[in-house]
């Protein structure tokens, strides 16, 4: 913490500008008024203060707003956001998507920090659900965001938000998460025709039950092996050889290369050898 010292004559800041750039820490503490700083926060980000100097500015804001910063200040934190702790952020009430975007921009290119995770949590809780615009924003900055949520948190995602999800956003999701997301996707895309529906639902199929896979097998979807390998084992096991053949279409030949891996291995063991032989792939049950 910077020692309290009087501001030298002529150094009192009349505005937040570049004249402060080479001020020592104690000079910033003594010569910058916290209320002035709060009203001119938008200027701070334009000035390349050192992180040490930003520490002093943060300290001034903390003294001015012990209960947490108002959103008018938060929106313009810029690099100062990197100085915030999760404890600081828990005091905030962030309601504007623009504020969220501004702060995520500062952290762009970095891994999701505890600060960012806390910020997102505060924002989403404040909104009550993960609406489409929020999800759009979060997955744009953090493609893995959706898969970082617990199944309980995912349950608050409305089906309408599913339209914002891209296949790469689901890359790291586990089956429990897809179990929650799949029914929402099914609902969101229910009015699409066969081939368009399959394109949209494909990345969510890791949460699909057997009956939906059976239904898809009747629609000439030609599922690729990568998608098939991500299906729930318990959903694949009851499928007949004929249904899997229809589901995969020309990709059925790929089963041979995957015969030692789940769910293909377990599925093969459940089939009659006669049925497997009809595929002509040399699969041994």
């Amino acid at each position: 913490e910077v020692e309290k010292t009087a501001c030298p004559s002529g150094k009192k800041a009349r505005e937040i500008d570049e004249s402060l750039i080479f001020y020592k820490k104690w000079e910033l503490e003594a010569c910058v008024d916290a209320a002035l700083l709060a009203t001119q926060m938008d200027r701070v980000n334009a000035i390349p203060f050192t992180y040490e100097q930003l520490d002093v500015l943060k300290h001034k804001l903390d003294e001015l707003y012990p209960q947490g910063y108002p959103e008018s200040v938060i929106q313009h934190l810029g690099y100062l956001f990197l100085k915030m702790s999760p404890e600081d952020i828990r005091k905030w009430n962030v309601t504007s998507l623009e504020t969220l975007k501004a702060l995520l921009e500062v952290n762009k290119g970095h891994e999701m920090s505890p600060q960012v995770a806390t910020l997102i949590d505060r924002f989403v809780k404040g909104r009550g659900q993960l609406d489409k615009d929020t999800l759009d924003t979060l997955t744009a900055f953090y493609p893995g965001y959706l898969c970082s949520l617990s199944p309980e948190e995912l349950s608050s995602v409305p089906p309408s938000s599913i339209w914002a999800v891209r296949p790469q956003d689901l890359d790291t999701c586990d089956p429990r998460q897809l179990d929650v997301l799949y029914p929402k996707a099914r609902l969101a895309f229910q009015n699409m025709n066969g081939s368009e529906y399959f394109v949209k639902i494909q990345s969510f199929l890791g949460g699909a039950p057997t009956e939906d896979l059976k239904a898809l097998s009747q629609q000439n979807v030609s599922m690729d092996l990568a998608t098939f390998m991500k299906l729930r084992t318990d959903a694949v096991l009851p499928l007949t050889v004929a249904e899997v053949q229809k589901l995969l279409g020309p990709h059925v030949e790929g089963l041979k290369a995957e015969e030692r891996h789940r769910p293909v291995r377990d599925w093969i063991l459940r089939q009659r050898q006669d049925d497997l032989d009809t595929l002509g792939l040399g699969l041994q049950g």
Epitope: E18, I21, F22, A46, I47, P48, F49, T50, Y51, E52, Q53, L54, Y79, L82, K83
Partner: nanobody, 124 residues
Framework: QVQLVESGGGVVQPGRSLRLSCAAS????????MGWVRQAPGKERELVAG????????YYADSVKGRFTISRDNSKNTLYLQMNSLRAEDTAVYYC?????????????????WGQGTLVTVSS
């Protein structure tokens, strides 16, 4: 490590001009900020002009606006201060200062480099 060497100071009559130069031993093209800071006798240091690489316009203290011009030549790693219509109150030691980086988020100080200064005396 960047070494800064100022030159161009001297004694000059009011109304005349001087051009200060600051030669850097290392590259200044990636510096976050470069400026001229002056310290008059018995007074505090004051930033008179600065180039913020993230901004579109240069900074000038109110007392020198319209009279001083800051510029740089990246190919020569040199910062300049053109001082016109000099006044007695411009008398000071002029330092060249360069900020290379912000430091480390969790503690380390930023890297600011300062020259030894060049004296400008405006007197009739």
């Amino acid at each position: 490590q960047v070494q800064l060497v100022e030159s161009g100071g001297g004694v000059v009559q009011p109304g005349r001009s001087l051009r200060l130069s600051c030669a850097a031993s290392g590259t200044i093209s990636e510096a976050l900020y470069m400026g001229w800071v002056r310290q008059a006798p018995g007074k505090e240091r004051e930033l008179v002009a600065g180039i913020n690489t993230g901004a579109t316009t240069n900074y000038y203290a109110d007392s020198v606006k319209g009279r001083f011009t800051i510029s740089r030549d990246n190919s020569k790693n040199t910062l300049y201060l053109q001082m016109n219509s000099l006044r007695a109150e411009d008398t000071a030691v002029y330092y060249c200062a360069v900020r290379k980086d912000r430091g480390v988020e969790n503690g380390g100080p930023g890297h600011d480099y300062w020259g030894q200064g060049t004296l400008v005396t405006v007197s009739s």
